[in-house]
Interface confidence: medium
């Protein structure tokens, strides 16, 4: 058992062009916090796979407000170390993810809003009990400087925290074959209780007679690297001299057991003996419980009352991943039609529509005559960002639904009098004029400029405009 410790030294803009804008503003003060996720081994794992070695969350840092016009400085950090306890052996090789989160403290509906500012990841070799290791990682325009170490919790000592120490039984020396426990010179190594022949470098035990392997080693005594089988090669020593079967790889070759589990062959397949805190066919599931608070961003933890039962995080809208640690970019689905801009408000999606469009997804074209009837015989005309109706005589308004006064525009020329009529308007022309709008002068000799007056109408009669 032991503790992995992480000390964040600074988080701020990295070198080079394109300094990031400060994540906080006077309108939107915020504070930072960090999350660390540890996984055993050097394998490249997906960001959302379980933090099998453990995870920790820092305290919130001091509230920060950007000074207007100033470049983003190194941001104020939370106090103290991030500590990730591990219950079993320290694997020696590990992967880490360190996330920098921003907590916005403005007028947020439903409490503060969290957003991931930066995520850095890496794979390292580290012996427990060694000095602090310093590191610099960059994520986009941000730079994170930090140190880390792994230390064993008494009575464990050693580079994997697998050797146990006990107080001296005699004042001057340790028992036969037992060394002093550096740096605890007043303590001695506990007598070895592992299975006889168990590799002292690559194996460990917690119970008498067992031999568990560290990451990268396999075999009953943890003496076989996972990259090779117990037989060197078909052209190597014969099976008679090595006592192994040359044909075909065995089911335990390459050690299918994760997280320090040891593999034993069964007649049909293999079986993993998992270290405490892990379970599953390949020891791939960590023994994190809901009590450890594994669900981020308001995720609801279900099950996982004890290390032998799995937990499930039910994520709130906008988040995904086994620990709800990944923000879903719902706008990446391009839900807004017709060039609308997408806003992910967390609890809902909004589309900001271009002028001329409306609707929750900007799907309605305000400039579209299709399916838009103009009433009372009007015709639809497109243009100018909004549809409009060209109305039949006697009607007006946006959709030609309003009755218009046909005489309002003074349609009768040359002093003619206008009369509203059920089918339009009628002009009573002044003497000397004729036509539907009294637009034609009557010649002095009584002849009209028109070829002929319509039957039944004399010049000067009211002309109905049809």
């Amino acid at each position: 058992a032991g503790v992995f410790e992480l000390q964040i030294h600074s988080f701020g803009p990295g070198p080079g062009p394109g300094a990031p804008r400060s994540p906080c503003s006077a309108r939107l003060p915020c504070r930072l916090f960090f999350r660390v996720c540890l996984k055993p081994g050097l394998s490249e794992e997906a960001a959302e796979s379980p933090c099998a070695l453990g995870a920790a969350l820092s305290a919130r840092g001091p509230v920060y407000t950007e000074q207007p016009g100033a470049p983003a400085p190194d941001l104020p950090l939370p106090d103290g170390l991030l500590q990730v306890p591990f219950r079993d052996a320290w694997p020696g090789t590990f992967s880490f993810i360190i996330e920098t989160w921003r907590e916005e403290l403005g007028d947020q509906i439903g409490g503060p809003a969290w957003s991931l500012l930066a995520r850095v990841a890496g794979r390292r070799r580290l012996a427990a009990g060694g000095p602090w290791a310093r590191d610099i990682q960059r994520a986009g325009a941000w730079e994170l400087r930090f140190s880390y170490r792994a230390r064993c919790e008494p009575p464990a000592v050693g580079t994997a925290c697998t050797r146990l120490c006990r107080p001296r039984s005699a004042p001057s020396r340790c028992g036969p074959g037992l060394r002093p426990c550096a740096p605890l010179e007043d303590e001695c190594e506990a007598p070895l209780v592992c299975r006889a022949g168990c590799s002292p470098e690559h194996g460990f035990c917690e119970q008498p007679g067992e031999c568990r392997c560290l990451e990268g080693w396999t075999g009953p005594l943890c003496t076989v690297p996972v990259s090779t089988s117990s037989c060197l090669s078909p052209r190597g020593p014969s099976s008679a001299t090595t006592g192994c079967l040359v044909p075909g790889p065995g089911p335990c070759d390459g050690n299918p057991c994760a997280n320090g589990g040891s593999c034993s062959e069964t007649p049909r397949s293999f079986e993993c003996t998992c270290p405490r805190g892990f379970y599953g066919l390949r020891c791939e599931v960590s023994g994190v419980t809901c009590a450890d608070g594994p669900c981020f961003n308001g995720g609801l933890c279900v099950g996982g009352a004890d290390p032998d039962s799995a937990y499930i995080c039910h994520c709130p809208p906008g988040f995904q991943g086994s620990n709800c640690e990944k923000r879903v970019d719902r706008c990446s689905l391009q839900p807004c039609r017709n060039g609308g801009l997408c806003l992910d408000l967390g609890h809902a999606l909004r589309c900001r529509c271009r002028a001329g469009f409306a609707g929750p997804r900007c799907e309605h074209d305000l400039d579209d005559c299709a399916g838009r009837a103009c009433a009372n015989g009007g015709t639809c005309v497109e243009g100018g960002g909004a549809h409009r109706c060209s109305c039949a005589l006697g009607f007006g308004g946006r959709d030609c639904r309003e009755r218009a006064d046909p005489c309002a525009a003074r349609p009768c020329a040359h002093g003619g009098r206008c009369y509203a009529h059920f089918s339009g308007l009628v002009c009573a022309c002044a003497p000397g004029y004729m036509g539907a709008r009294c637009e034609f002068p009557v010649h002095p000799d009584g002849a009209s400029a028109l070829p002929a007056a319509p039957p039944g109408l004399r010049p000067g009669d009211p002309q109905r405009y049809l």
Partner: antibody, heavy 119, light 107 residues
Framework: QVQLQQPGAELVRPGTSVKLSCKAS????????MHWVKQRPGQGLEWIGV????????NYNQEFKGKATLTVDTSSSTAYMQLSSLTSEDSAVYYC????????????WGQGTSVTVSS | DVQITQSPSYLAASPGETITINCRAS??????LAWYQERPGKTNKLLIY???TLQSGIPSRFRGSGSGTDFTLTISSLEPEDFAMYYC?????????FGGGTKLEIK
């Protein structure tokens, strides 16, 4: 009259970043969205993204997420596009284009900036 | 993403002639297709949007038609300044996508 001014060319090293500018004049900068478009030599046009200068809300083509970052400086009526981790694939002409924000799309274009990524 | 296929990629014609350029969308884009003209030393020019709406200041010899998946740009009575590169672009859904272009050259 509406004008979008872009620098003619940028020569940059692989692995570095470049920030392209597009200075707008002749209209109210915050009232019109700004698009960015890529054109590789001898190839067609690719839409990168659009930004609303009034509040910096942006929408990206997924192909360019992580590659391009759109920003604006309203005090100088300038739109910017930062391209990061440059490779030879990023060598192209990059245009800014104003969105009319009525029903028409890109109604005014800049002359384009030619970016060459070379060691 | 909506794929836009533009044809032909090359076209030779004489001044005074009428030509057509076609664009086909992989899925329906309603009427939302724009046409642009690209000339060396000039900025790209918007000709037509929403399939058939003529941008202000563009001569009426440019005409757009079509809806759904098939669209056409017709240029009648070709003028010397019309010989250029033409692109269509759908502006219905993000990401906006362009056709591959048509180079119109003098015969």
């Amino acid at each position: 009259q509406v004008q979008l001014q872009q620098p003619g060319a940028e020569l940059v090293r692989p692995g570095t970043s470049v920030k392209l500018s597009c200075k707008a004049s002749g209209y109210t900068f915050t009232s019109y969205w700004m698009h960015w478009v890529k054109q590789r030599p001898g190839q067609g046009l690719e839409w990168i993204g659009v930004i609303d200068p009034s509040d910096s809300l942006a929408n990206y083509n997924q192909e360019f997420k992580g590659k391009a970052t759109l920003t604006v400086d309203t005090s100088s009526s300038t739109a910017y596009m930062q391209l990061s981790s440059l490779t030879s694939e990023d060598s192209a002409v990059y245009y800014c284009a104003r969105d009319s924000t009525v029903v028409a799309p890109m109604d005014y274009w800049g002359q384009g900036t030619s970016v060459t990524v070379s060691s | 993403d909506v794929q836009i296929t533009q044809s032909p990629s090359y076209l030779a014609a004489s001044p005074g002639e009428t030509i057509t350029i076609n664009c086909r969308a992989s899925t329906s884009i309603s009427k939302y297709l724009a046409w642009y003209q690209e000339r060396p030393g000039k900025t790209n020019k918007l000709l037509i949007y929403s399939g058939s709406t003529l941008q202000s200041g563009i001569p009426s010899r440019f005409r757009g038609s079509g809806s759904g998946t098939d669209f056409t740009l017709t240029i009648s009575s070709l003028e010397p300044e019309d010989f250029a590169m033409y692109y269509c672009q759908q502006h219905h859904v993000y990401p906006y996508t362009f056709g591959g272009g048509t180079k119109l050259e003098i015969k």
